[in-house]
């Protein structure tokens, strides 16, 4: 167990733990103090004791020992009084730190005393060698517990230069592969540097004497070190491995290293000392095997095989760890070690080897683990696991601390938890104690909640409730108990309504540039803070201050000016502090394609055949397949900025060979088209000019017509520039009279016309027009018939007669004219006619003439829309291209017809049962009026009960109808008549019912002069006539409110003038009917120009 930080108020003891100790190997030099360090923590305070070579050692009782008086320290220092006092203290030391919970133990500290280094006295004989031979100058330094450094120097303290020939070995000897006379020196001195004592000692100088020789004999290599053919050595894992081969021979041998058993680990191998030394860093198991050195010169080679075995000091696989345990738990301390050879593991408890402990102990050792079952406080101990092999020793202290702690709930009491329906709630109850307390959750009734499968407990005391329901709201109790006590807390759970998106955004496809609106409706628990936000492809969307791209309001997201980059997934996120729901929609932005990015012309050699190949890169389709590509061209010379389509190709095609015209400056562009229309065009291509060629087309619409009687103008539609096939084009015009078979006359012109002069009137000609350019002529042209100029026709159409069809239409007929007298192409006939006046009376008005053009192949015409009962004048002329000929004239009259409708029918109410009808005669009599026909019927009887009678006086303008029902509305119809019958009707609806009720003055107003006032009103259509009084009453004190006598007025008269009024006076006008007040208004008469005094009592400014 681990005591949580929140578990307060329990002062737990701590077993001893070694915090600092001296290194495993301590070398002491003559002048040094001996300091043995051992520090440990623990509660209660730790006591220290030492052993030396397994025997109890009491530092305090030793002379010259200073013990540190510190609560956590058992360290001591020995100060010597002579140079070899340390010899007395050599040995293996161990420190034990104890308190009432157990004993921790330090590792073994080997204390070694190193004396002052001295070279044994020796007499060094001179070394004599012949030039070319090998020699070894020995060093043999005194032994040292610490590594030392060797240098070879001469008496001038100059280093002996080393190279492939002269080398110092790892053992300090100086090896010469072959000697030169220059090696002859008497002062080869070996220096040994002892870093520990900071001293350098030197060997007696060696005198090397080299005898010169005339003939140095070549020798094959021989190894000076190692001397045998093979050797075995042990390398320690993780440590460096140094292999050395030093050879002699002449010429000087070179050294190579090989590894027959596998590849040399290049990243960890270095070669030193002119290849004589191989150093392998951080040896691993894989470095086991054979390493070979090969010494070579021109005469041969020598080799040595090193067989390397990789071994390892003990190392941890699993180091035992200190732990706290509650009563009843099982304690297991794992001590897994590895090494080569396999280390031997021993256990101690509180520093005592388990073998020395009483046999009734409850521990057991199983596969490198120390196990104690059902631990109790009395089982608290510090254990030591020690592993050793020949390369080293490994020690670990680990305690088993069995504590008894009362149960305590570390979660706050009375916490409120909120979660939404359908989700999972987690009620916390973190409890601690030793033994580990049991945790139970109870409902308000004290019943365990675990009967419902939705409730599930966690090992850490948390209670989970899944698929929350509204009725899970309430109080829950957590009870934690161990053998010392029990404690309870309460948790409040409130289950809220889950947030739901009731209508999420819908996936949509929209056009570029348009706007899209996504809507989102959600329901929230009313007690929670709701939020609706929007995300686009996982990014939060916000209205940007400097842009109106997004508009977000009331669950709506509007994206303006859609672009293809706006395409993606948009989601509405509805959230509260308790839950989040998301609804996603996909937006596809569609539109016309993107531009064609690249356009290339190829096969330009085909230009000579008026072809070229155009290739392009496909355009972006913007989510609508490209249906076609439009290839266009522009000629910058002839029609700049004007693009012509050369054709369209299917949307899956990206190249085409185009058929071109000769001599056009082509610049191409390609536009992709999909269902939304064309995209932006591609960049323009380079301009290419097709070679010139003779024209392939001739002009069309060739015509020959005179614009005078003695000429013929030949015209044609000029060739479009793209058909010229050259920089310029001209026209070869040929003509001859038709049927002569004579020679053609010809002229070449640049204009699109030619005037042939001195021709006879209206003669047919054969005409040909051919395109010509610098490369030749166009194809053989077709012959067209043209005519020389026309003259005015001399033919007069002969009238056959006029047939009266009805009162407003006649049929005019004439005989065809003699074509010889037309003097040109008969284009048709002009028929002109006009009304001379009515048969009733002739008018003096301006005469309006009507014209009808009749085609040449027609000799009759119907003139319609004529006025009945009228006299007409008629002219018929033949016409050709020059104009009209002489006219044939005729006069005719139209018979009587029915008249037009009467004008302005008014209904005037006379009483509840009578109406006066008032009208005006029709504008168009179309004959002699004979009278009127009046018909009427009640409206609600659907046309039944129609009454109709003739009014035989054409001068009649009014008619009084009596015996009408005051409760009905009527439809009145009035028609004028001639002998041909009744004409169009005028219709009005009305009756006495609606009109004889409360009188209505309608739009009534009053105006005033100096001494009079005019009251005007508009009588309502059909309103019954009635009489009423008008009373003028003067206002103001000096007038005394004087009234004029009331006047009797008739409604139909529309206005009334009251005279004898006072100037500059306000009057009230009262209208009465049958003594009932009906209306009131005010008016003021004009002043006379005199200055008037204000009435008494008024202040003036």
């Amino acid at each position: 167990i681990q005591i949580p930080e929140e578990y307060e108020g329990h002062h737990v003891m701590e077993p001893p733990v070694i915090t600092e100790q001296s290194p495993r190997r301590l070398v002491v030099f003559p002048t040094d103090d001996i300091s043995l360090k051992c520090e440990a923590s623990g509660k209660p305070e730790v006591q220290f004791r030492w052993t030396r070579d397994g025997v109890h050692f009491k530092p305090k009782e030793e002379l010259g020992v200073t013990v540190y008086q510190s609560p956590h320290s058992g360290s001591f220092t020995i100060t010597g009084n002579n140079s070899n006092f340390a010899q007395r203290f050599q040995g293996i030391y161990r420190c034990f730190a104890s308190n009432k919970l157990g004993t921790a133990m330090s590792h073994e500290i080997r204390l070694m005393a190193e004396g002052a280094p001295k070279w044994p006295k020796e007499t060094v004989k001179p070394v004599e060698v012949e030039e070319g031979e090998s020699v070894v100058l020995p060093c043999n330094p005194p032994p040292s517990a610490e590594p030392l450094r060797i240098y070879w120097m001469n008496s001038k303290i100059l280093h002996i230069k080393q190279d492939e020939r002269v080398t110092m070995g790892q053992n300090g000897n100086l090896y010469f592969a072959n000697v030169l006379t220059s090696d002859n020196h008497s002062d080869y001195i070996c220096h040994a540097h002892f870093p520990g004592t900071r001293t350098i000692i030197q060997k007696e100088p060696i005198d090397l004497r080299v005898k010169a020789t005339n003939s140095m004999i070549d020798r094959k290599p021989r190894l000076l070190f190692p001397t045998n053919s093979s050797s075995h050595l042990v390398a320690l894992q993780g440590q460096p491995l140094v292999l050395e081969c030093i050879a002699e021979g002449f010429p000087t041998p070179t050294i190579k290293w090989l590894r027959p058993s596998g590849p040399m680990p290049a990243d960890r191998v270095t070669y030193q000392n002119h290849n004589k030394t191989l150093q392998l860093l951080k040896v691993g198991e894989e470095d086991d095997g054979e390493y070979r050195c090969l010494a070579e010169n021109s005469l041969g080679s020598a080799r040595h095989a090193y067989y390397v075995t990789v071994e390892a000091a003990p190392y941890w696989l699993h180091k035992p760890q200190s732990h706290l345990y509650g009563p009843g738990e099982t304690a297991r301390l794992d001590c897994q070690v590895q090494g080569r050879p396999q280390p031997e593991v021993t256990w101690r408890i509180n520093g005592i080897p388990v073998e020395e402990l009483a046999k009734d102990q409850k521990y057991r050792i199983q596969r490198g683990a120390l196990i104690l079952s059902n631990v109790q406080p009395s089982d608290t101990m510090v254990t030591q696991c020690e592993a050793r092999n020949r390369h080293g020793l490994l020690l670990a202290n680990a305690y088993i601390y069995v504590v008894q702690l009362p149960a305590k709930i570390l979660t706050a009491d009375n916490q409120t938890y909120m979660a939404v329906q359908g989700s999972t709630a987690y009620l916390l109850c973190k409890a601690f104690g030793a033994p580990v307390p049991s945790v139970q959750w109870l409902d308000e009734d004290g019943t365990t909640v675990l009967q419902d499968e939705r409730f599930f407990p966690y090992a850490n005391g948390t209670l989970g409730i899944r698929d929350l329901q509204a009725n899970d709201t309430g109080r829950y109790f957590c009870l934690a108990a161990n053998d010392q006590n029990n404690v309870t807390i309460m948790a409040n759970l409130k289950v809220k309504d889950a947030t739901q998106i009731t209508q999420g955004p819908r996936s949509t496809i929209e056009k570029k540039g348009s706007r899209v609106t996504f809507t989102c409706q959600a329901s929230f628990d009313p007690s929670l803070q709701p939020s609706i936000t929007w995300r686009g492809d996982g990014r939060d969307l916000q209205e940007l201050g400097d842009s109106d791209k997004y508009f977000i309001e009331d669950g709506r997201l509007v994206i303006h000016s859609l672009d293809y980059s706006d395409q993606g997934n948009y989601s509405c996120v509805a959230s509260t502090e308790l839950d989040v729901v998301e609804s996603r929609a996909q937006l596809l932005v569609v539109g016309s394609p993107g531009p064609v990015p690249r356009l290339v012309l190829s096969d330009l050699h085909l230009l000579t055949q008026s072809q070229v190949r155009v290739s392009w890169s496909p355009a972006e389709d913007h989510n609508a397949p490209i249906e076609k590509y439009d290839i266009e061209f522009e000629d910058k010379e002839m029609a700049p900025e004007k693009w012509y389509s050369l054709g369209k190709v299917p949307g899956n095609q990206t190249s085409t060979t185009l058929k071109l015209s000769p001599y056009v400056h082509y610049t191409f562009r390609v536009t992709a088209i999909n269902k939304y229309g064309p995209g932006e065009p591609s960049p323009v291509s380079e301009t290419v000019v097709t070679p010139e060629a003779a024209p392939e087309k001739n002009p069309v619409d060739v015509k020959g017509e005179g614009n005078e009687t003695t000429n013929m103008v030949i015209t044609w539609k000029p060739l479009r520039w793209m058909d010229w096939n050259a920089p310029q084009v001209q026209y070869r015009v040929q003509w001859r009279p038709q049927g002569t078979r004579g020679p053609w006359q010809e002229q070449i012109v640049s204009d699109p016309f030619l005037v042939v002069s001195n021709t006879s009137t209206f003669v047919p000609y054969e005409i040909k027009v051919q395109a010509v350019n610098s490369q030749g002529k166009g194809p053989e042209p077709q012959v067209t018939i043209g005519y020389s100029g026309e003259d005015y026709p001399q033919a007069i159409p002969e009238l056959e007669g006029i047939e009266i069809l009805n009162s407003s239409a006649v049929l005019v007929k004439w005989r065809p004219v003699d074509l010889a007298q037309v003097k040109g192409h008969l284009r048709g006939y002009n028929v002109t006619y006009w009304r001379e006046g009515s048969q009733r009376k002739h008018s003096k008005r301006h005469i309006h003439k009507d014209h009808v053009v009749v085609p040449a192949n027609t000799t009759s015409v119907i003139l319609s829309g004529l006025r009945p009962y009228s006299s007409y004048h008629l002219e018929v002329q033949a016409f050709n291209g020059r104009g009209s000929g002489p006219a044939s004239e005729f006069t005719f009259s139209t018979p009587e017809g029915v008249p037009g409708h009467p004008e302005a029918l008014h209904l005037e109410c006379q009483s509840n049962t009578s109406l006066l009808l008032r009208w005006q005669p029709p504008l168009s009599h179309n004959g002699v009026l004979t009278g009127y026909v009046l018909s009427y019927h009640p409206l609600d009887e659907g046309g039944k009960g129609q009454l109709s009678f003739n009014l035989r006086d054409p001068e009649l303008r009014t008619h009084n109808l009596t015996d009408l029902s005051p409760h009905l509305r009527y439809r009145f119809q009035l028609q004028a008549t001639t002998k041909e019958g009744p004409g169009e009707a005028i219709v009005r609806e009305g009756g006495t019912m609606a009109l004889s009720g409360i009188s209505d003055f309608g739009n009534i107003s009053a105006t005033a002069g100096e001494n009079y006032s005019v009251v005007s009103w508009v009588p309502k259509e059909g309103q019954c006539n009635f009489r009423f009084h008008i009373l003028f009453k003067a206002l103001g004190e000096e007038k005394g409110g004087a009234s004029l006598s009331p006047q009797y007025v008739s409604y139909n008269q529309s206005s009334y003038t009251q005279w004898d009024l006072q100037p500059d006076t306000d009057y009230e006008i009262h209208l009465f009917k049958e003594r009932m007040f009906r209306h009131q208004m005010a008016v003021k008469t004009n002043g006379t120009g005199r200055v008037r005094l204000p009435p008494a009592g008024f202040a003036t400014e």
């Epitope: 190829s602 330009l604 050699h605 323009v684 380079e686």
Partner: antibody
Framework: QVQLVQSGAEVKKPGSSVKVSCKAS????????IQWVRQAPGQGLEWMGY????????DYAQKFQGRVTITADESTSTAYMELSSLRSEDTAVYYC????????????WGQGTTVTVSS | DIQMTQSPSSLSASVGDRVTITCRAS??????VAWYQQKPGKVPKLLIY???TLHSGVPSRFSGSGSGTDFTLTISSLQPEDVATYYC?????????FGGGTKVEIK
């Protein structure tokens, strides 16, 4: 009369870039494409690429793709050719030439700019 | 890319001699071939296009012929001012490619 005037000779280190200018006069600059051609010492002519000065659209020979950039400035009637990651084999005379109106031929040439690439 | 191979790489002829230079294309280029003249220390100058059309201002002693893959430039009567290197160029397809050049000298 039509003239194309190029910038002066350049000596560059391998790996660096060079930018050669070509100022046009005597005609409407935007009406004719500008092409670039180079000639290594004692060697033939090698086409590099072109630019349309009216739209600034350019295209290059595959060999120079990614290393060459041809640009134009209508306001000064000047075309530019920039070659990057120079190597010793880029030592050459670089010519700008006006493309004939109507065919990919070279009717007017600049005087040439010698570019030497040497460490 | 279309390769243009010129031969000979150099020639020496006397004033008044008829000189012929050939150019071979690695594929059919129709008549989309031009010839240029580059005098020592000068820029190239267009002589002929469409294999046989003389550029304006070029003396009539220069002529061109050929179609498909084989083309010829002929100087009917060599003049001292004709000393130059002559290049053929194909413009049927991009990249535009030139021949290696033919150096013409006076004996």
């Amino acid at each position: 009369q039509v003239q194309l005037v190029q910038s002066g000779a350049e000596v560059k280190k391998p790996g660096s870039s060079v930018k050669v200018s070509c100022k046009a006069s005597g005609y409407t600059f935007t009406n004719y494409w500008i092409q670039w051609v180079r000639q290594a010492p004692g060697q033939g002519l090698e086409w590099m690429g072109y630019i349309n000065p009216s739209t600034y659209y350019s295209d290059y020979a595959q060999k120079f793709q990614g290393r060459v950039t041809i640009t134009a400035d209508e306001s000064t009637s000047t075309a530019y050719m920039e070659l990057s990651s120079l190597r010793s084999e880029d030592t050459a005379v670089y010519y700008c030439a006006r493309r004939q109106f109507g065919l990919p031929l070279f009717d007017y040439w600049g005087q040439g700019t010698t570019v030497t690439v040497s460490s | 890319d279309i390769q243009m191979t010129q031969s000979p790489s150099s020639l020496s002829a006397s004033v008044g001699d008829r000189v012929t230079i050939t150019c071979r294309a690695s594929q059919d280029v129709g008549t989309a071939v031009a010839w240029y003249q580059q005098k020592p220390g000068k820029v190239p100058k267009l002589l002929i296009y469409w294999a046989s059309t003389l550029h304006s201002g070029v003396p009539s002693r220069f002529s061109g012929s050929g179609s498909g893959t084989d083309f010829t430039l002929t100087i009917s009567s060599l003049q001292p001012e004709d000393v130059a290197t002559y290049y053929c160029q194909q413009y049927s397809n991009y990249p535009l490619t030139f021949g290696g050049g033919t150096k013409v000298e006076i004996k």
